[in-house]
C-alpha cells in the first residue's frame, strides 16, 4: 500500500493478493467483459471476497467468498 | 457540461489556515471523487487528498496528514480544502478535480480554475 | 508511495514532428496510468485515460501505450496548440502520484 493515511479506518478483507485464499463462488455484480486485476486503492473494497477490475467500464467488481453476497460482498447469503 | 468553479485568491500570515471551496454545477456531485491538487509556482502537480465515493470519506496523502481536511456540502454541491499551520512552501495553486469514477479516484477529467493562495509574512 | 519519474524533462520540437514522452513508475502499476497536458495558467487537460484510451475530445495524434512501469505518450505530428506541459499521473494506489513534468518547446 502507498504511504497514505484513511480516516476513520474501513474494516474489510483485503481479499486477492499474494497469499490470501479466497473462493470465487458469486459474481456481483454480473458483467462480461474482460478483467484485470484491481487497482491498489481498491483494496478494501470486496469486504468479503475478492477484487477484479472491469477494464471497458472502469469499475471494481467483486468475487464473493462462500456464504457472502452484495455488490461488495457485505451481507451474508441466508440461503447459502 | 460539468464545472467545477473555486473561490478567490487568498493571502495569509504563517502560521494560519486556508479554505478553499470548489462549486459544482452540471452533473451528479455527490457520485464522483472530487481531489484537490496543488502546484507551487515553476513547479509539478501534487495530489493532496480526495472524497473517495465508495469509502464515504477523505483519503489525504501522507505529507498533509493532519494539516489538511476535505470535505464536501451535498446540498449545495460544494467541496472545500482546509490547510492549517500555513508555511512559505504551501504558496500554490490548489486545483480541485472530479475523477471519472464513480467508486474511487481515477482520472482527473474536470478540473477547477485554480486558486492561488500566497503564503507571506 | 510510488514514484513516477518522466524523461526527458523538456524537449525541443518543430511543427510536424512525432514526439514520445516517457514515464515510469518504481513498482508495476498495471495500465493505471493518465496523460495531462497544462499550458501555463491554466488547469491540466485529461488527455489519455487507463494508459492508451482516447479522452473524449482530444485529437487523434495524441496516443498513449504501456503496462506494467514503462508508458509512452506519442504526439504524431506535433501542432502549435501541442507546445506545453505533459504530466503523466497513476491510479494504482494511494498517494495519488504525478510525473514531475515535461515541457515541450518549439525549436
Known amino acids: 500500500s502507498g504511504n497514505s493515511t484513511r480516516s476513520p479506518e474501513t474494516n474489510g478483507l483485503s481479499c486477492g493478493y499474494p497469499g490470501e485464499n479466497c473462493t470465487a463462488t458469486t459474481v456481483q455484480p454480473k458483467r462480461k467483459g474482460h478483467f484485470s486485476r484491481c487497482p491498489k486503492q481498491y483494496k478494501h473494497y470486496c469486504i468479503k471476497g475478492r477484487c477484479r477490475f472491469v477494464v471497458a467500464e472502469q469499475t471494481p467488481s467483486c468475487i464473493c467468498d462462500e456464504g457472502y453476497t452484495g455488490a461488495r460482498c457485505e451481507r451474508v447469503d441466508l440461503f447459502y | 457540461q460539468v464545472q467545477l468553479v473555486q473561490s478567490g485568491a487568498e493571502v495569509k500570515k504563517p502560521g494560519s489556515s486556508v479554505k478553499v471551496s470548489c462549486k459544482a454545477s452540471g452533473g451528479t456531485f455527490s457520485s464522483y471523487a472530487i481531489s484537490w491538487v496543488r502546484q507551487a509556482p515553476g513547479q509539478g502537480l501534487e495530489w493532496m487528498g480526495g472524497?473517495?465515493?465508495?469509502?464515504?470519506?477523505?483519503v489525504y496523502a501522507q505529507k498533509f496528514q493532519g494539516r489538511v481536511t476535505i470535505t464536501a456540502d451535498e446540498s449545495t454541491s460544494t467541496a472545500y480544502m482546509e490547510l492549517s499551520s500555513l508555511r512559505s512552501e504551501d504558496t500554490a495553486v490548489y486545483y480541485c478535480?472530479?475523477?471519472?469514477?464513480?467508486?474511487?479516484?481515477?482520472?482527473?477529467?474536470?478540473w477547477g480554475q485554480g486558486t492561488l493562495v500566497t503564503v507571506s509574512s | 508511495d510510488i514514484q513516477m519519474t518522466q524523461s526527458p524533462s523538456s524537449l525541443s520540437a518543430s511543427v510536424g514532428d512525432r514526439v514520445t514522452i516517457t514515464c515510469r513508475a518504481s513498482?508495476?502499476?498495471?495500465?493505471?496510468l493518465n496523460w495531462y497536458q497544462q499550458k501555463p495558467g491554466k488547469a491540466p487537460k485529461l488527455l489519455i485515460y487507463a494508459a492508451s484510451n482516447l479522452q473524449s475530445g482530444v485529437p487523434s495524434r495524441f496516443s498513449g501505450s504501456g503496462s506494467g512501469t514503462d508508458f509512452t505518450l506519442t504526439i504524431s505530428s506535433l501542432q502549435p496548440e501541442d507546445f506545453a506541459t505533459y504530466y503523466c499521473?497513476?491510479?494504482?494506489?494511494?498517494?495519488?502520484?504525478f510525473g514531475q513534468g515535461t515541457k515541450v518547446e518549439i525549436k
Open positions: 499521473q497513476q491510479y494504482d494506489d494511494f498517494p495519488m502520484t
Open positions: 513498482q508495476s502499476i498495471s495500465n493505471f
Open positions: 478535480a472530479r475523477s471519472s469514477s464513480t467508486y474511487g479516484i481515477h482520472a482527473f477529467d474536470y
Open positions: 472524497i473517495v465515493p465508495w469509502m464515504g470519506e477523505a
